[in-house]
Interface confidence: low
C-alpha cells in the first residue's frame, strides 16, 4: 500500500523534527523499543509496536513504512531489512 502525499509530507516533517523538544518530551514518558531484522526486503514489528526507523542491507538508503508496522527496503535483491520498533510503556 502506498502512502498518500499528505502522509508523505507528515513523515518527512517527522524526520526534520526528530531532534526537537517534543521528541525529548515523548522520550521522558518511557518508550519500550526493540530491533527486528529479517531476511529479504521486509521487516515487521511485533504486535503493538510501531516503526520508528528502518535500515537496509547492501548500502540501500531507500525505504518506506507500510501500515506503520513494517519496513520495506526498496532496492533490488535486498539481503536483509531492519526495523526499529517502539511502543509507549504500559
Amino acid at each position: 500500500k502506498t502512502l498518500c502525499s499528505m502522509e508523505e509530507a507528515i513523515n518527512e516533517r517527522i524526520q526534520e523534527v526528530a531532534g526537537s523538544l517534543i521528541f525529548r518530551a515523548i522520550s521522558s514518558i518511557g518508550l519500550e523499543c526493540q530491533s527486528v531484522t529479517s531476511r529479504g526486503d521486509l521487516a515487521t514489528c511485533p504486535r503493538g509496536f510501531a516503526v520508528t526507523g528502518c535500515t537496509c542491507g547492501s548500502a540501500c538508503g531507500s525505504w518506506d513504512v507500510r501500515a506503520e508496522t513494517t519496513c520495506h527496503c526498496q532496492c533490488a535483491g535486498m539481503d536483509w531489512t531492519g526495523a526499529r520498533c517502539c511502543r509507549v510503556q504500559p
Partner: antibody, heavy 125, light 106 residues
Framework: QVQLQESGPGLVKPSQTLSLTCTVS??????????WIWIRQHPGQGLEWIGD???????QYNPSLKSRVALTLDRSKNQFSLQLSSVTAADTAVYYC?????????????????WGKGTLVTVSS | SELTQDPDVSVALGQTVTITCQGD??????ASWYQQKPGQAPVLVIF???NRPSGIPDRFSGSSSGDTASLTITGAQAEDEADYYC??????????FGGGTQLTVL
C-alpha cells in the same frame, strides 16, 4: 540549477564497449540524496531504463541488460559513467543521464527530476 | 511493455484530455509522467501520483485507480502537443516506462 551533460563517442563498432560519461553540475553525486540514472531511447521508440548508481556504490540494472552493463562514479570529478559491452546495432540509441531523488532518508522517488540533453550513439562498422 | 499506454490520443484546443497508463505494479506503486517534444529530453510533469515540479502548469494533474494511472490536461494548449510517458517501479525496485502516447492538439 542542476545540469547533466552526457559525453562520449558517437560511433561504436559492433562487439566493442560503449562508454559514456555524465558530468553533473549544481549537485553533488556524493550526496546520499540521489541515485544517478542511465536511460536510452531507440530511434523513434520509447524510453528504456538501463540502470542506476548511488554514491555508496549500490547499483541496480535492467535485468535485460544486466550481463552487459557496468555503472561507476568518480566523486572527484562529479561524474558517473556507463559501460555497455558487446554492443550490436540494436544498441543504437539516444542515451540520457538523469537524477532520481530516491536516495533521501525517507525512501521515495523512482522518478527523474533532471535529465541531460542526450547523446546519440550509433553502433556500426 | 509492463506498462501499457494508448499510442495516440488527440484533443481539441482548450479541451480536457486524459492519458492512461495501465499495469499491475500500479496497484502498489506510484506512476510518474514525462513530456517529450521532438529532439528534446523528457521533462518530468507529474511525480508521486499527483505532484507537479516547479514550472509545470497547473493544468497538468495526475490520479490513479486500481491498476491505472492517469495524466489529465485541463484546457490543452498547442504547446502540450508531445509524447507522454509514464514510469513506475516493480517490487524488486527495477523501473520501466510505458510505450508512450503521442498527444495531438487539434
Amino acid at each position: 540549477q542542476v545540469q547533466l551533460q552526457e559525453s562520449g563517442p558517437g560511433l561504436v563498432k559492433p562487439s566493442q564497449t560503449l562508454s559514456l560519461t555524465c558530468t553533473v553540475s549544481g549537485a553533488s553525486i556524493s550526496s546520499g540524496g540521489y541515485r544517478w540514472i542511465w536511460i536510452r531511447q531507440h530511434p523513434g521508440q520509447g524510453l528504456e531504463w538501463i540502470g542506476d548508481i548511488h554514491y555508496s556504490g549500490s547499483t541496480q540494472y535492467n535485468p535485460s541488460l544486466k550481463s552487459r552493463v557496468a555503472l561507476t562514479l568518480d566523486r572527484s570529478k562529479n561524474q558517473f559513467s556507463l559501460q555497455l559491452s558487446s554492443v550490436t546495432a540494436a544498441d543504437t540509441a539516444v542515451y540520457y543521464c538523469a537524477r532520481d531523488p530516491r536516495g533521501h532518508t525517507y525512501g521515495y522517488g523512482y522518478y527523474f527530476d533532471y535529465w541531460g540533453k542526450g547523446t546519440l550513439v550509433t553502433v556500426s562498422s | 511493455s509492463e506498462l501499457t499506454q494508448d499510442p495516440d490520443v488527440s484533443v481539441a484546443l482548450g479541451q480536457t484530455v486524459t492519458i492512461t497508463c495501465q499495469g499491475d505494479r500500479l496497484r502498489r506503486y506510484y506512476a510518474s509522467w514525462y513530456q517529450q517534444k521532438p529532439g528534446q529530453a523528457p521533462v518530468l510533469v507529474i511525480f508521486r501520483k499527483n505532484n507537479r515540479p516547479s514550472g509545470i502548469p497547473d493544468r497538468f494533474s495526475g490520479s490513479s485507480s486500481g491498476d491505472t494511472a492517469s495524466l489529465t490536461i485541463t484546457g490543452a494548449q498547442a504547446e502540450d502537443e508531445a509524447d507522454y510517458y509514464c514510469n513506475s517501479r516493480d517490487t524488486s525496485g527495477t523501473l520501466s516506462f510505458g510505450g508512450g502516447t503521442q498527444l495531438t492538439v487539434l
